[in-house]
């Protein structure tokens, strides 16, 4: 019986460990600054790193600019978006800016896109200052199904800060769906 | 066999509970306002509470102004930093401010410091208003190794809001490293 | 013995699954815009959705405008609050605004209310721009006891953005109390 108990314990430990890791997908994606679209309109950001520096992904997929859910669950989603402008980059098109982020969910089965979270601010970036900066942070807890896709839209993409510590988004699974 | 099963269940329950608690380090550190440096562009904040009010720590260490990781894992890190100024405190050095936070990771083995997250804003705090306030929030999911240290740097430390609900940072372990 | 092992495994799998789900309460509550109080003073927001759109709740209770904890534990709490004004809504009472959020905890046993987190900004929303927007995000890790209540207070409630992706708060349990 002792051997059997050890076997039970062993298999359980193995199963618990394995299921724990399998049950916890995550991603932290950082902006790929080599391919930021220009303009001041609202655009979807499709170029993100998933495997360099702080960027990483596990049990989720990054494809076509979207973070794809592989495992049903409740996830905490977050995004940090930084905008900046220095006078040496040239004049702004307007001093009155709307700096925004939208975290959206797309369901392939029912082709539709919905905004989960938004944040931002209107700003007056006057010529009296040589440098301007502004960051947005959003986060929330959402039910995600396998196959659903998360993407990031921003206004004024040409003003994005390209640093990996500045502009990123991510997700981690917290629990299963009942 | 029933007794054996009960023993298996009991030991397992005990093990599961114990390992679950051991596997989840956390910290929530609040600013110690008795020792805020004055100053400049970017200073490291070294005085934080870890055991009073909302501040708490478990399976992590706070030493020399840094939050030290004791257990490898993926952690969610966050910081909330509030700046404020009332005209009764005296005049500002400049009305054009850069209010920033940097969450940094230092590896002792390879002496180097890297910024994990940054946030903030340039602000125009004019004399037309007697009171000014601004808060920054950042958060993200990072792989941390035992011995690595997390610290907070800010601009304009003399403008920090000293309340425990205003200026704090923290971390909690979400999952093991594969 | 094999049957016994299967029974042990089965009961364990069941117990593990059940305890895991039971151990992880959560809530994501979105603003109910049909009942936002007016005014510019600091008010408690009592109308939130818990079961439509992105709003959901499990193993927690929403009652009388407060999120009630049913299970002791350490929780990650968060809030995202958006304010906006368009000139078509009429003139602002003042162009100098203090846009703030306070996440508070109330203990029924010891009738007292404490602010866990605060965030926001003073803003100058001048008439030179037809539209103004600003979002606040706060988050932190707190020990909550069964029966304690979480509520949201804001300044300038009449300026709140009523969208479910804009103004919300939530919580999820991360771990048990030792």
């Amino acid at each position: 019986i002792r051997a059997e108990k050890a076997m039970v314990d062993g298999s359980w430990l193995d199963l618990a460990k394995r299921s724990k890791l399998e049950a916890q997908p995550f991603a932290h994606l950082t902006i790929n600054a080599t391919d930021i679209p220009s303009g001041s309109h609202k655009v979807s950001l499709s170029s993100w790193y998933h495997d360099r520096g702080w960027a990483k992904i596990s049990n989720m997929t990054f494809s076509n600019g979207k973070l794809i859910v592989n495992q049903d669950g409740f996830y905490y989603l977050y995004a940090n978006i930084c905008f900046r402008h220095h006078e040496t980059s040239g004049d702004l098109a307007t001093e009155y800016l709307q700096l925004m982020v939208y975290v959206t969910k797309t369901s392939i089965k029912i082709p539709s896109s919905h905004t989960l979270m938004k944040g931002g601010s209107t700003k007056y970036w006057s010529g009296n200052s040589e440098f301007h900066f502004y960051s947005i942070n959003v986060g929330g807890f959402f039910k995600l199904r396998s196959g659903e896709e998360i993407s990031i839209e921003v206004s004024n993409p040409s003003l994005l800060d390209p640093d990996q510590d500045a502009t990123y988004f991510g997700a981690f699974k917290v629990r299963d769906i009942d | 066999i029933r007794a054996e099963k009960a023993m298996v269940d009991g030991s397992w329950l005990d093990l599961a509970k114990r390992s679950k608690l051991e596997a989840q380090p956390f910290a929530h550190l609040t600013i110690n306002a008795t020792d805020i440096p004055s100053g400049s562009h970017k200073v490291s904040l070294s005085s934080w509470y870890h055991d009073r009010g909302w501040a708490k720590i478990s399976n992590m260490t706070f030493s020399n102004g840094k939050l030290i990781v004791n257990q490898d894992g993926f952690y969610y890190l966050y910081a909330n930093i509030c700046f404020r100024h009332h005209e009764t405190s005296g005049d500002l050095a400049t009305e054009y401010l850069q209010l920033m936070v940097y969450v940094t990771k230092t590896s002792i083995k390879i002496p180097s410091s890297h910024t994990l997250m940054k946030g903030g804003s340039t602000k125009y705090w004019s004399g037309n208003s007697e009171f000014h306030f601004y808060s920054i929030n950042v958060g993200g999911f990072f792989k941390l190794r035992s011995g690595e240290e997390i610290s907070i740097e800010v601009s304009n430390p003399s403008l920090l809001d000293p309340d425990q609900d205003a200026t704090y940072f923290g971390a909690f372990k979400v999952r093991d490293i594969d | 013995i094999r049957a016994e092992k299967a029974m042990v495994d089965g009961s364990w799998l069941d117990l593990a699954k059940r305890s895991k789900l039971e151990a992880q309460p959560f809530a994501h509550l979105t603003i109910n815009a049909t009942d936002i109080p007016s005014g510019s003073h600091k008010v408690s927001l009592s109308s939130w959705y818990h079961d439509r759109g992105w709003a959901k709740i499990s193993n927690m209770t929403f009652s009388n405008g407060k999120l009630i904890v049913n299970q002791d534990g350490f929780y990650y709490l968060y809030a995202n609050i958006c304010f906006r004004h368009h000139e078509t809504s009429g003139d602002l009472a003042t162009e100098y605004l203090q846009l703030m959020v306070y996440v508070t905890k109330t203990s029924i046993k010891i009738p007292s209310s404490h602010t866990l987190m605060k965030g926001g900004s003073t803003k100058y929303w001048s008439g030179n721009s037809e539209f103004h927007f600003y979002s606040i995000n706060v988050g932190g890790f707190f020990k909550l006891r069964s029966g304690e209540e979480i509520s949201i207070e804001v300044s300038n409630p009449s300026l709140l953005d009523p969208d479910q992706d804009a103004t919300y708060f939530g919580a999820f349990k991360v771990r048990d109390i030792d």
Epitope: E130 | S40, D91, L92, A93, T94, E95, L97, S155 | -
Partner: nanobody, 128 residues
């Protein structure tokens, strides 16, 4: 690189007035800067006199200068001034202007370490 050039020093009698100038160059604007005046008398330590926030025009003075000295700036010309009235023999010193990025409160700019750039100085002598 910021350059600072002082002018306006000289020999005056007790009770006279003098206006020092400090011309700043090397940047298109100084809106985020604090400009300060320091002085050093022979055989003495360098001493803070006054500081001005370039953006707001608010000033901060050493006690002995309050009511007698006034600092101002012309943001269009990038010049700072120190108007000194009712001069005393103890005001004799080399007066230097300094510039530093503005952080925190203006009252913190009594410390020389807060300034990144310094002028060469101009001599002020008050004879009795």
């Amino acid at each position: 690189e910021v350059q600072l050039v002082e002018s306006g020093g000289g020999l005056v009698q007790v009770g006279d007035s003098l206006r020092l100038s400090c011309e700043a160059s090397g940047r298109s604007r100084f809106s985020t800067y604090v400009m300060g005046w320091f002085r050093q008398a022979p055989g003495k330590e360098r001493e803070f006199v006054a500081a001005i926030s370039w953006s707001s025009g608010n000033a901060y003075y050493i006690d002995s200068a309050k009511g007698r000295f006034a600092t101002s700036r012309d943001t269009a010309k990038n010049i700072m001034y120190l108007q000194m009235n009712s001069l005393k023999p103890e005001d004799t010193a080399v007066y230097s202007c300094a510039a530093g990025r503005g952080y925190g409160l203006l009252s913190e700019y009594t410390q020389a370490a807060r300034y990144d750039y310094w002028g060469q100085g101009t001599q002020v002598t008050v004879s009795s």
